[in-house]
């Protein structure tokens, strides 16, 4: 899915109102020094691509994130504010249903959610390289058409 035409401001509002708090709850009890972010993103569509991948694609050692509250709210926000996103997720939903039902918080999952928090930070405030536009919103606005 190409996230270029999503309504980024609406997704940001959804993240800040609820998703961010669910991520903090998931990470509660984890030391803030524990994980170093290794996944990065360069602009808002790229950030959403990485966020989708880490949230919904099972990885070795962490197969259950898609059933977490923050994941369900992320999916809802993308479905509402990214035109055509829902249609691309039918197969992914089937795969999700086949994933194991129990929610197990492993260290690998905690690390993955720490990465997600970092990706969301960059989504909320993209930091473009200096040689590019010094105005991070202009970079988005060139491609960005609001869909309500």
């Amino acid at each position: 899915y190409d996230f270029t035409n999503c309504d980024f401001e609406k997704i940001k509002a959804a993240y800040l109102s609820t998703i961010s708090k669910d991520l903090i709850t998931y990470m509660s009890g984890t030391k803030s020094t524990e994980f170093n972010n290794t996944v990065s993103c360069s602009n808002r569509p790229h950030c959403l691509t990485e966020i989708q991948s880490l949230t919904f694609n099972p990885t070795a050692g962490c197969a259950s994130l898609a059933k977490e509250m923050f994941a369900m709210k992320t999916k809802a926000a993308l479905a509402i504010w990214c035109p055509g996103y829902s249609e691309t997720q039918i197969n992914a939903t089937q795969a999700m249903k086949k994933a194991r039902k129990s929610k197990v918080t492993t260290n690998k999952c905690l690390e993955q959610v720490s990465q997600l928090q970092g990706l969301w930070r960059r989504f909320n405030r993209p930091l473009l390289k200096q040689q590019g536009s010094s105005d991070y919103k202009d970079d988005d606005d060139k491609h960005h058409h609001h869909h309500h």
Epitope: A13, S32, R121, R125, L127, S134
Partner: antibody, heavy 119, light 107 residues
Framework: EVQLVQSGAEVKKPGSSVKVSCKAS????????IEWVRQAPGQGLEWIGV????????NYNENFKGRATLTADKSTSTAYMELSSLRSEDTAVYYC????????????WGQGTTVTVSS | SIVMTQSPDSLAVSLGERATINCKAS??????VTWYQQKPGQSPKLLIY???NHYTGVPDRFSGSGSGTDFTLTISSLQAEDVAVYYC?????????FGQGTKLEIK
């Protein structure tokens, strides 16, 4: 506990340079942007620029471009702000600050470093 | 650059009364506004982010509202420890910019 500890006060001559350090502790240094802000005596806050310690990416206020240089040393969890070609109007308290967990604010600030430029 | 203009420059309010500080952006900043409190000789402290979200530990008497170009910080019942300078900031576009500050005193 998250802490940002800055280097001590500096007195500099016009035309010289100053390098202020900001040592971070209590969190994963590479994961959060470090912002630099200054405050002239009796004045408001002015944003200088920002660095991503994870990859060295920066963004500067045009007012400081060419004079301010932001760097970060991951091995010591320390960010630096160097300002060159100093003039009297650069006399100010310089602050480093960390972005918050959502990327939309500065939640932890250093104690500030007073830089005085005087001949 | 986006100019953030606060009003009033200074404000004197009686203890227990409501204090209201306004911030106007020279162009729309969506909801990308933060409020900070700075007491004499101290570093700024985060109060409110993304217009209306309380930072951890900030008392409920502080609240933020607005969108687009007009924003407000309200202290519902002024306490002695609220004497400070308050700054709004936009992070919608680089360069990030602050308002000039509003000095809040006890009447």
């Amino acid at each position: 506990e998250v802490q940002l500890v800055q280097s001590g006060a500096e007195v500099k001559k016009p035309g010289s340079s100053v390098k202020v350090s900001c040592k971070a502790s209590g969190y994963a240094f590479s994961n959060y942007l470090i912002e630099w802000v200054r405050q002239a005596p009796g004045q408001g806050l002015e944003w200088i620029g920002v660095i991503d310690p994870g990859n060295g990416d920066t963004n500067y206020n045009e007012n400081f471009k060419g004079r301010a240089t932001l760097t970060a040393d991951k091995s010591t969890s320390t960010a630096y702000m160097e300002l060159s070609s100093l003039r009297s109007e650069d006399t100010a308290v310089y602050y480093c600050a960390r972005e918050d967990n959502t990327g939309t604010a500065f939640d932890y600030w250093g104690q500030g470093t007073t830089v005085t430029v005087s001949s | 650059s986006i100019v953030m203009t606060q009003s009033p420059d200074s404000l004197a309010v009686s203890l227990g009364e409501r204090a209201t500080i306004n911030c106007k952006a020279s162009q729309s900043v969506s909801s990308d506004v933060t409020w900070y409190q700075q007491k004499p000789g101290q570093s700024p402290k985060l109060l409110i982010y993304y217009v209306s979200n309380h930072y951890t530990g900030v008392p409920d008497r502080f609240s933020g509202s607005g969108s687009g170009t007009d924003f407000t910080l309200t202290i519902s019942s002024l306490q002695a420890e609220d004497v400070a300078v308050y700054y709004c900031q936009q992070h919608h576009r680089f360069p990030l910019t602050f308002g000039q500050g509003t000095k809040l005193e006890i009447k």
